[in-house]
Interface confidence: low
Amino acid sequence: MCYGKCARCIGHSLVGLALLCIIANILLYFPNGETKYASENHLSRFVWFFSGIVGGGLLMLLPAFVFIGLEQDDCCGCCGHENCGKRCAMLSSVLAALIGIAGSGYCVIVAALGLAEGPLCLDSFGQWNYTFASTEGQYLLDTSTWSQCTEPKHIVEWNVSLFSILLALGGIEFILCLIQVINGVLGGICGFCCSRQQQYDC
């Protein structure tokens, strides 16, 4: 297996996932494409944790670009030995992967909490409340209760969809970073085998 090639594939995947996380998080600020709920501070508290923008987004770009740079990075080498430098790079990618694990982990935790608490909405008695906070997430299984939120329109579907997307994207990022920890450790210990015969396309 070519550890550098695999890292590069993971890096490219993370860039795409990070961008999707940022988009999903931004959409949470605009239920039904309207800006007034954000300006009136009528958004779920977990939207303001920037889990998709920071955790699953910007923070994920650092390890992503580190991983992408591994395959074509010659490094200076270690005492003139190129492979030794490559090993150092692979091991340093483990540190970058741990940062990615922290970011994606944050994204997953906040998205899960956002899903469990449910949206801030105008409920059927005319007050802005976390209507489903006391249901411990059971509202997710009973869509008939979603009509308790009367404004913004379809806010439950909006929140559930986007927080679920963030949860899934964060989970995939977490797994990919975990793979890169293993990949980096193996690449650092076993050596950086990048002969044409051993290239491994992820």
């Epitope: 007034k36 008695f125 005319g126």
Partner: antibody, heavy 120, light 106 residues
Framework: QIQLVQSGPELKKPGETVKISCKAS????????VKWVKQAPGKDLKWMGW????????IYAADFKGRFAFSLETSASTAFLQINNLKNEDTATYFC?????????????WGAGTTVTVSS | QIILSQSPAILSASPGEKVTMTCRAN?????INWYQQKPGSSPKPWIY???NLASGVPARFGGSGSGTSYSLTISRVEAEDAATYYC?????????FGAGTKLELR
């Protein structure tokens, strides 16, 4: 036609209890909460609180906690306001109101009001 | 809580005149509603969301404002406009009403 029909005027003595009804028609009762507003003679409007017609959960404004109780008879699309241990200062007209949702939130349908007079 | 102060308390006007009444909040709010009440009747929704006329309200009425200061304007007062006008907010709990402006015609 959407309307809220309230019960007739009440004359009570201090210490007694009064129960006012508010029957909704022309819309789905459980989709809109019922709010209560007090207007003492010659005075301004005072919001008393509301009841969630979906869950039955009552919410009381700070000045109306204790002697006041909101309740429902969902099958009859009716909300009730009960005032216990009546005092002279409870003399007022009580309105039940529907709250309009959407982009703007306001009281779009008002009952005609029930006048409660407390006098010994 | 948000306190709404309406001024003037009593407003005298002659038919055809332009009148403006104001509603000030002690803290910024996102919008305000106005209700018209005539003696012996329940209040009627008049202007909602600061500037939107409720159903059946004549076009001579208008609403404006933002933040802490809002106003209701009648471009040409008519006899039927004599009533008390209340402003109301629910940007912040609890819901509050102003003390009202009584419009009298001379």
């Amino acid at each position: 036609q959407i309307q809220l029909v309230q019960s007739g005027p009440e004359l009570k003595k201090p210490g007694e209890t009064v129960k006012i009804s508010c029957k909704a028609s022309g819309y789905t009762f459980t989709n809109y909460g019922v709010k209560w507003v007090k207007q003492a003679p010659g005075k301004d409007l005072k919001w008393m609180g509301w009841i969630n017609t979906y869950t039955g959960n009552p919410i009381y404004a700070a000045d109306f906690k204790g002697r006041f109780a909101f309740s429902l008879e969902t099958s009859a699309s009716t909300a009730f306001l009960q005032i216990n241990n009546l005092k002279n200062e409870d003399t007022a007209t009580y309105f039940c109101v529907r709250f309009q949702y959407g982009d703007y939130r306001y009281f779009d349908v008002w009952g005609a009001g029930t006048t409660v007079t407390v006098s010994s | 809580q948000i306190i709404l102060s309406q001024s003037p308390a009593i407003l005298s006007a002659s038919p055809g005149e332009k009148v403006t009444m104001t509603c000030r909040a002690n803290s910024g709010i996102s919008f305000i509603n106005w209700y018209q009440q005539k003696p012996g009747s329940s209040p009627k929704p008049w202007i909602y969301g600061t500037a939107n006329l409720a159903s059946g309200v004549p076009a001579r009425f208008g609403g404006s404002g933002s933040g802490t200061s809002y106003s209701l304007t009648i471009s040409r007062v008519e006899a039927e406009d004599a009533a008390t006008y209340y402003c109301q907010q629910w940007s912040s709990n609890p819901l509050t009403f102003g003390a009202g402006t009584k419009l009298e015609l001379r």
